[in-house]
């Protein structure tokens, strides 16, 4: 499990991973699947209307420690989560928008799925 | 790892216009905000305004609003920004700049990853 | 525009010295405040970000704190590879504006 800036990958995990991805796609990517040596993840965001988005695809291992944990945006919601432990992973992850009022609430702890571990903090 | 190339210089005429490039690697280049920074000589940064490759959806800073249009070619993983009407206080160093996270539709305000800036003369 | 102030243009300090780099905003800007460092040659590398997260590859010696209006940068045991131009930005509000930037040199 990969907590707060600490980086200990399951021993499962593959070298290559397969991801789902929706509007995360690469050029390269075939029927919605992309590739990493990294994570994939799924995300879900608030556009102007209100309305939820929610997006996939896959992230490079340098850099994936910041991009797992929810970081601060003005004035929007976003939430992502992150996994590695099998291909396709992402389809299982289901990030929630946090409460309106707690804007802060990305201070927290990496949004990390291990082998139906979760962790949520909203 | 995240690379922006941009051209070392560019030498323009008064009157004309110049379209500055930038070409992305080493990450999914539709994923995330491309932002452009001025910066005239001897000064400071001013942000000219960011555009989205996967959407196109753009914002811009009201000051440059009628001097720069900004697009990208998702094919070769290049942004671009063309500036108008050029007169010498365009003259600057023009930097393109990759956000911090990845985002499909919400906007992020931090530019981790910085080209290596295009020097624009407008000189007759 | 929310105007960002670096009152200090240019700093001298020696060698292993602590440096601090003030910055302010003329609205609260919520802790969405960014730091920038310019070598000489132009180049331009993110430090810190949400006043106080080093991005990566950064060197733990430098850290940012504050709040409100009022932030700072601060190198601890300054190496010569820290010369360069420092730069805040506020990202709490469109359009982005950065402070004017503080040289830092060496005494």
């Known amino acids: 499990k990969k907590e707060d800036g600490e980086s200990t990958a399951p021993t499962a995990r593959p070298k290559v991973l397969r991801c789902k991805c929706h509007h995360h796609c690469p050029e390269d990517s075939v029927n919605n699947i992309c590739s990493t040596d990294g994570y994939c993840f799924t995300m879900i965001e608030e556009d102007d209307s209100g309305t939820p988005v929610v997006t996939s695809g896959c992230l490079g291992l340098e850099g994936s420690d910041f991009q797992c944990r929810d970081t601060p945006i003005p004035h929007q919601r976003r939430s992502i989560e992150c996994c590695t432990e099998r291909n396709e992973c992402n389809k299982d992850l289901h990030p929630t928008l946090p409460p309106l009022k707690d804007r802060d609430f990305v201070d927290g702890p990496i949004h990390h799925k291990h082998h139906h571990h979760h962790h949520h903090h909203h | 790892q995240v690379q922006l190339q941009q051209p070392g210089a560019e030498l323009v005429k008064p009157g004309a216009s110049v379209k500055l490039s930038c070409k992305a690697s080493?990450?999914?280049?539709?994923?995330?905000?491309m932002h452009w920074v001025k910066q005239r000589p001897g000064q400071g940064l001013e942000w000219i305004g960011m555009?989205?490759?996967?959407?196109?959806?753009?914002n811009y800073n009201e000051s440059f609003k009628s001097k720069a249009t900004l697009t990208v070619d998702k094919s070769s993983s290049t942004a671009y920004m063309q500036l108008s009407s050029l007169t010498s206080e365009d003259s600057a160093v023009y930097y393109c700049?990759?956000?911090?996270?990845?985002?499909?539709?919400?906007?992020?305000?931090?530019?981790?990853?910085w080209g290596q800036g295009t020097i624009l003369t407008v000189s007759s | 525009d929310i105007q960002m102030t670096q009152t200090t243009s240019s700093l001298s300090a020696s060698l292993g010295d602590r440096v601090t780099i003030s910055c302010r905003a003329s609205?609260?800007?919520?802790?969405?405040l960014n730091w920038y460092q310019q070598k000489p040659d132009g180049t331009i590398k993110f430090l810190i970000y949400?006043?106080?997260r080093l991005h990566s590859g950064v060197p733990s010696r430098f850290s940012g704190s504050g709040s409100g209006t009022d932030y700072s940068l601060t190198i601890r045991n300054l190496e010569q590879e820290d010369i360069a131009t420092y730069f805040c930005?506020?990202?709490?509000?469109?359009?982005?504006?950065f402070g004017g930037g503080t040289k830092l040199e060496i005494k």
């Open positions: 700049a990759r956000d911090l996270l990845i985002a499909t539709v919400v906007v992020t305000p931090y530019f981790a990853y």
């Open positions: 080493g990450y999914t280049f539709i994923s995330y905000w």
């Open positions: 555009i989205h490759p996967n959407s196109g959806s753009t």
């Open positions: 609205q609260d800007i919520s802790n969405f």
């Open positions: 949400y006043t106080s």
């Open positions: 930005q506020q990202g709490n509000t469109l359009p982005y504006t």
